[in-house]
Structure formats: C-alpha cells, structure tokens
C-alpha cells in the first residue's frame, strides 16, 4: 500500500483551509478523548479511478468521497482520518485531513474527496473514514467503512495499467489444446515479443473430480527474435490411466518484468462425452 507520488496532496476548498498529513492510524483523540465530537461521515463512496505518475505510469487508485451531515457537530470537526486496509495482508495505510480553519454551514453540503491510495489488481480493501476527534470510549461511532474489490488484470481497463502490464497482461497466448491418438496432447500458443523461457504445466483429473491423477511439467526455451509472435507447438505424452481424462494446461511465462510471478494462462480439455446408450451385449459368448 502506498500513496501516488504525482502531486502535492491538498484538501483545501473554498471556505476551508486544510492540509493532508501522514498518519500512524492512531489519532491523538484515542489517547486523549474529547467531550464534544462530530457525527459520522455520510454517503461514503469508493470508486476505482486511474491516475498517472510524473513518470507517466498508470496506476489504479481508490477514489474516496464522502459528505458531512448537516448538524451542529461540524463546529467540533477538526479533520478526518482516511484508512485503507488490505484484507489479505492486514497492511494498513492512513492519512489525516487536518482542518486549519473552523467549518461553517454554507449553502451546499460539505463534500470531500481523496484519490491518492494506490490499489493492487485483484485485491480487496476496507476503506474507513473517521471524523476527528474520535468519540469517547462509549460514544456513538463517527466513522463509515466500505469494502472494495479491485478487478484483476483480465479486466479491459485494468489490463493497460502499469502493474498489470508489468505482470504480462498484454500477452494473449491464444492457447489451443487438442487430443491426439496414443495418449497425447498437442498444445499450441503464441509467443510474446521477449526472449524468455516458458513452462507448460499439465494437470490431469478424473471426470468430475478435483484431485489430480497426473502432473507433468514441460520447459520451453527462450525463442529467438524471429520467432516472436509465432505459434509454438508442443506435444505432451499423457499417462495411460483409464478415466484420467480432464486436462488443464497452464502456460507460465518468465518475462523480465515479472520473473516467476507473471500472469499464467490456462486452457482445459474436458473428458469425452459418455454415450447415453448402454454397450450392446454380444450375440455369442466366447467359451475361453
């Protein structure tokens, strides 16, 4: 979790002098409770936006927006703490809006936005806006939270972001898999424009079961420049196991930008359809 570096962070608006500060996520009002505290944020919205850095890189960011309730507690509102928690790692990053002037009611509802938290593809976040000072231990909560899942790199808009392109999102291998005679699979895919090796991971399963009955790994050496964007054809030999008929083929590239953590592509071959009619019984029975 980090903040986008592309410009100075501002929260001032007409009628309010405000500055954005780094926060430890542990505001002073936890330790020194105040008697009078503001009410909670209203209409918290989290949206996925895209922003460029000064270097021209494109990153997905969480656009956080909320409004104030129209009650007298804005007289005691000193700022807001914005917290983003990445759910699978428990990593948290906070910033604090510090109001340098008193808020006054005006003809339209106060609205605040912040679009500088960089988020990762396929990650879920809990976004919380706490009004400051925080409430006394038994006071009504004055925060609002929402969970937000970022699309993965297969999403058309995410595909062109820097983190997705770094993990190989622009490569479309267009995998085809066909079953050959004599327990073989023919795998064909399009190479990318980089001289890097690939790995084909074959996992076979019985019909309607999810524990594997055969696994095989096949190494493909780095192609020469004249082979870039060409089709690579590989024939894999299967284990002759009856019923081990559903095959998942996964292609793992090792691009320089993502090494052994690149996006993998896969294709699946289903088991052949079982005939609905029962096997015919022969007219005669052999005697031996």
């Amino acid at each position: 979790l980090r903040l986008l570096d592309h410009r100075a962070l501002v929260c001032s608006q007409p009628g309010l002098n405000c500055t954005v500060k780094n926060s430890t996520c542990l505001d002073d009002s936890w330790i020194h409770p105040r008697n009078l505290t503001p009410s909670s944020p209203k209409d918290l919205q989290i949206q996925l936006h895209f922003a460029h850095t000064q270097q021209g890189d494109l990153f997905p960011v969480a656009h956080i927006e909320w409004t104030l309730q129209t009650d007298a507690s804005i007289l005691y509102l000193e700022g807001a703490e914005l917290s983003v928690l990445q759910l699978n790692t428990n990593e948290r990053l906070c910033v604090r809006f510090e109001f340098l002037s008193k808020l006054r009611h005006h003809h339209r509802r106060w609205r605040f936005t912040f679009s500088h938290f960089v988020v990762d593809p396929d990650q879920e976040y809990e976004v919380t806006v706490h009004h400051l000072p925080k409430p006394i231990p038994d006071g009504d909560p004055n925060h609002q939270s929402k969970n937000f899942l970022v699309p993965d790199c297969e999403h058309a808009r995410m595909k062109v972001t820097t983190p997705c392109m770094s993990s190989g999102s622009l490569w479309d291998p267009n995998i085809t898999v066909e079953t050959l005679e004599a327990h073989q699979l023919r795998v064909s895919f399009t190479l990318w424009n980089e001289s890097t090796h690939y790995q084909i991971l074959l996992t076979s399963f019985p019909h309607m079961e999810n524990h594997s009955c055969f696994e095989h790994m096949h190494h493909i050496p780095a192609p020469r420049p004249e082979e870039f964007h060409q089709r690579s054809n590989v024939t894999l030999t299967l284990r002759n196991l009856k019923g081990c008929c559903r095959h998942q083929v996964q292609i793992q590239p090792f691009f320089s930008s993502c090494l052994n953590d690149c996006l993998r592509h896969s294709a699946t071959v289903s088991c052949p359809e079982m005939p609905d009619t029962p096997e015919p019984i022969p007219d005669y029975m052999p005697l031996w």
């Epitope: 209409d43 919205q45 989290i46 949206q47 996925l48 936006h49 969480a62 656009h63 879920e124 939270s145 929402k146 969970n147 937000f148 899942l149 970022v150 699309p151 993965d152 297969e154 999403h155 058309a156 808009r157 995410m158």
Partner: nanobody, 127 residues
C-alpha cells in the same frame, strides 16, 4: 439509454424455486459488478447478493446464503438470481442494481451507492 429490466417474479409456495433475470443495456455490462437488492412491504432496502464483473467473486446476505445463487452471462448482458427453498419472509420487490465504478463494493453496506436501478420485480411467497 442506460437501463436495467427485471423479470421472473411471481406468486410461489414456500419451499419452491424461482429464477429472476435482469437485462442490462446502454453501458458496458461486462465492466461492472452487479447486485440484487430487495424491499419487503413496509420495510427498507436490503442488499441480497453481489457478483463481480467476471463472476470471480460472489457474496450473499446471511438471510439467503445457501438458498440463493447469483450468476451473470456477459455475452447476453444478463444478471440472474436463482432462488431455492423460498420462505414467506422472502416476499419483496427485487431490484437489480449496478456498481457505480469498475471495482466491486462487497457486502451489505453498498446499497446507498448503486447508480443504476431497475424498476423491480415482485416475488410473493405464500401458501
């Protein structure tokens, strides 16, 4: 014109099943997460279920978990809600709704932010 049109509601006995559909038009359906929200007679809105843009993630309210299944067909610009083991308390007007951004607002705290709603389809569960 951006719109969502629900169908499939009706009168059904407790324990039976029903499948709701929602046809989307006027926006790139496969970019956005979608949700089902319901409103029982005389009650407020209750989020029922949500599904991410590529069906990779689905969520359900505790009251329908294990009985309802949300799905989508991006090729047909359609959202579905398969409702099994229906109960009298499932009686409500069911709306499909669109997430306002490309992300997925997960869980029940999201109904206030959805930007496009259908007109609703009525489900009545009664013996």
């Amino acid at each position: 014109e951006v719109q969502l049109v629900e169908s499939g509601g009706g009168l059904v006995q407790p324990g039976r099943s029903l499948r709701l559909s929602c046809a989307a038009s006027g926006f790139p359906f496969d970019d956005y997460a979608m949700h089902w929200v319901r409103q029982a007679p005389g009650k407020g809105l209750e989020w029922v279920s949500g599904i991410s843009w590529n069906s990779g993630r689905t969520d359900y309210a505790d009251s329908v978990k294990g009985r309802f299944t949300i799905s989508r067909d991006n090729a047909k610009n359609s959202l579905y809600l398969q409702m099994n083991s229906l109960r009298v308390e499932d009686t409500a007007l069911y709306y499909c709704a669109k997430d306002p951004s490309l992300g997925y607002c997960s869980g029940g705290s999201c109904s206030d932010v959805f930007d496009i709603w259908g007109q609703g389809t009525m489900v009545t569960v009664s013996s």
